[in-house]
Interface confidence: low
């Protein structure tokens, strides 16, 4: 039996489904008594679900996890994995055995959009030319660690006096706060991006300085 | 064989600086996350920094050395670096660099160094 | 921050009893917790994590169990290289990670 799995990693979004695919070639007359089927975690071979002895045994990890039973005896193994979280991320083997075996590992890569960053300016009044500011750019619930970028108003990256820091909260995501110390000019916009790595989404924010107001 | 060896560690006056590094071999450094985690003489363990593997490096520290050590990497070398600086009595311990399972963030270490003393008195 | 609290801090056994230690989180961390050993002089060594999961090389006489706020680690029949002090750690609430202050487990 030859187990065939995508070699692309699936990446699924924190909170939805993800299925990892599955499939192997039955035999003639091939038939769901003769199956064992398991999935595990790779790296630790923890059992995630299992089908042996003709039956579904079910969910072992977090009674998240579902097979598709109508397909098994067309060959289709896939996992559906259920409300995605954080500690999901890693490698699954998908364990076939009829007659021989065979064994093909997927990867999991979890994902959770950031939001759009809010900015805000210390101090945020009073300002002249000259004075030193403190940028502040936020966003939230992300997953993996972004990449912050700052820019002046005409593109210039701005590298310099940057601190970035990311907090993960109990769910695993990140929460980042990048901090820009910049001089002002006479007038200038000062824009943030937050990008995440896996999902290629960018967030922007920006503040404008115009003498006053300012405008976010 | 997966690897770490510390050093740098020394006595200090109050108020002094040093300079842990950490070795790494024997598997992918640039791929893991890393940590420095140190024991106070007859006492427990204590997280102490992490960064992660890349996107800048991001860094994480506990409140007691924020603002006076800065953990950092050069993955072209391999090697972990802790600068301790404004060093206190308190601050006297056993420094470990270890490996965390994970490459995403911080979980379990499961690669540990031997560990360098480094002692704060005058 | 999540305090973990170990119990006992000593536990006074001999080569072949069961050793229960236990851990208790200050609020729940799921099953984010790791166990570990340390030796005099030695770096510590990863046991037990994700509650359950033994490391690399690690004997299956070391159990981990719990959920939420209290786990235990068991040791099912203890060898004299066993003699040891054993931390658990958390980390599904970072930074920072937290571990617990230690239980000892000593020949009686």
């Known amino acids: 039996v030859e187990v065939q799995v995508s070699e692309d990693p699936v990446v699924a979004l924190v909170d939805t489904d993800a299925t990892l695919r599955c499939s192997f070639s039955p035999e003639p007359g091939f038939s769901l008594a003769q199956l064992n089927l398991i999935w595990q975690l790779t790296d630790t071979k923890q059992l995630v679900h299992s089908f042996t002895e003709g039956r579904d045994q079910g969910s072992a990890y977090s009674n998240r996890t579902a097979l598709f039973p109508d397909l098994l005896v067309q060959g289709n193994a896939s996992l559906r994995l259920q409300r995605v979280r954080v500690t999901d991320e890693g490698s699954y083997t998908c364990f076939v055995s009829i007659q021989d075996f065979d064994s093909a590992a997927v990867s999991l890569q979890v994902a959770a959009p950031y939001s759009k960053p809010s900015m805000t300016l210390e101090p945020n009044k009073d300002l002249r030319p000259g004075n030193m500011v403190t940028i502040t750019c936020s966003s939230y619930q992300g997953y993996p660690e972004a990449e912050v970028f700052w820019k002046d108003g005409q593109g210039v990256p701005l590298t310099g006096n940057v601190t970035t820091s990311q907090m993960a909260n109990e769910r695993g995501l990140f929460d980042v706060h990048s901090v820009l110390r910049v001089v002002l000019g006479a007038n200038g916009t000062y824009s943030c991006l937050v990008r995440n790595p896996v999902l290629q989404q960018d967030a922007h924010g920006s503040v404008t300085i115009t003498g006053q107001p300012l405008t976010f | 064989e997966v690897q770490l060896l510390e050093s740098g560690g020394g006595l200090v006056q109050p108020g002094g600086s040093l300079r842990l590094s950490c070795a790494a071999s024997?598997?992918?450094?640039?791929?893991?996350?890393m940590s420095w985690v140190r024991q106070a003489p007859g006492k427990g363990l204590e997280w102490v920094s992490s960064?992660?593997?890349?996107?800048?490096?991001?860094?994480y520290y506990a409140d007691s050395v924020k603002g006076r050590f800065t953990i950092s990497r050069d993955n072209s070398k391999n090697t972990l670096y802790l600068q301790m600086n404004s060093l206190r009595a308190e601050d006297t311990a056993v420094y470990y660099c270890?490996?965390?399972?994970?490459?995403?963030?911080?979980?379990?270490?499961?690669?540990w160094g031997q560990g360098t003393t480094v002692t704060v008195s005058s | 921050e999540i305090v973990l609290t170990q119990s006992p801090g000593t536990l006074s056994l001999s080569p072949g009893e069961r050793a229960t230690l236990s851990c208790r989180a200050s609020?729940?961390?799921?099953?984010?917790l790791a166990w570990y050993q340390q030796k005099p002089g030695q770096a510590p060594r990863l046991l037990i994590y994700n509650t359950v999961t033994r490391a690399t090389g690690v004997p299956d006489r070391f159990s981990g169990s719990g959920s939420g706020t209290e786990f235990t680690l068991t040791i099912s029949s203890l060898q004299s290289e066993d003699f040891a002090v054993y931390y658990c750690q958390q980390y599904n609430s970072w930074p920072p990670l937290t571990f617990g202050g230690g239980t000892k487990v000593e020949i009686k």
């Open positions: 270890a490996r965390d399972r994970s490459p995403y963030q911080c979980r379990s270490m499961d690669v």
């Open positions: 609020q729940s961390i799921r099953s984010d």
């Open positions: 024997g598997f992918t450094f640039s791929d893991y996350y």
């Open positions: 960064i992660s593997i890349s996107y800048g490096g991001t860094t």
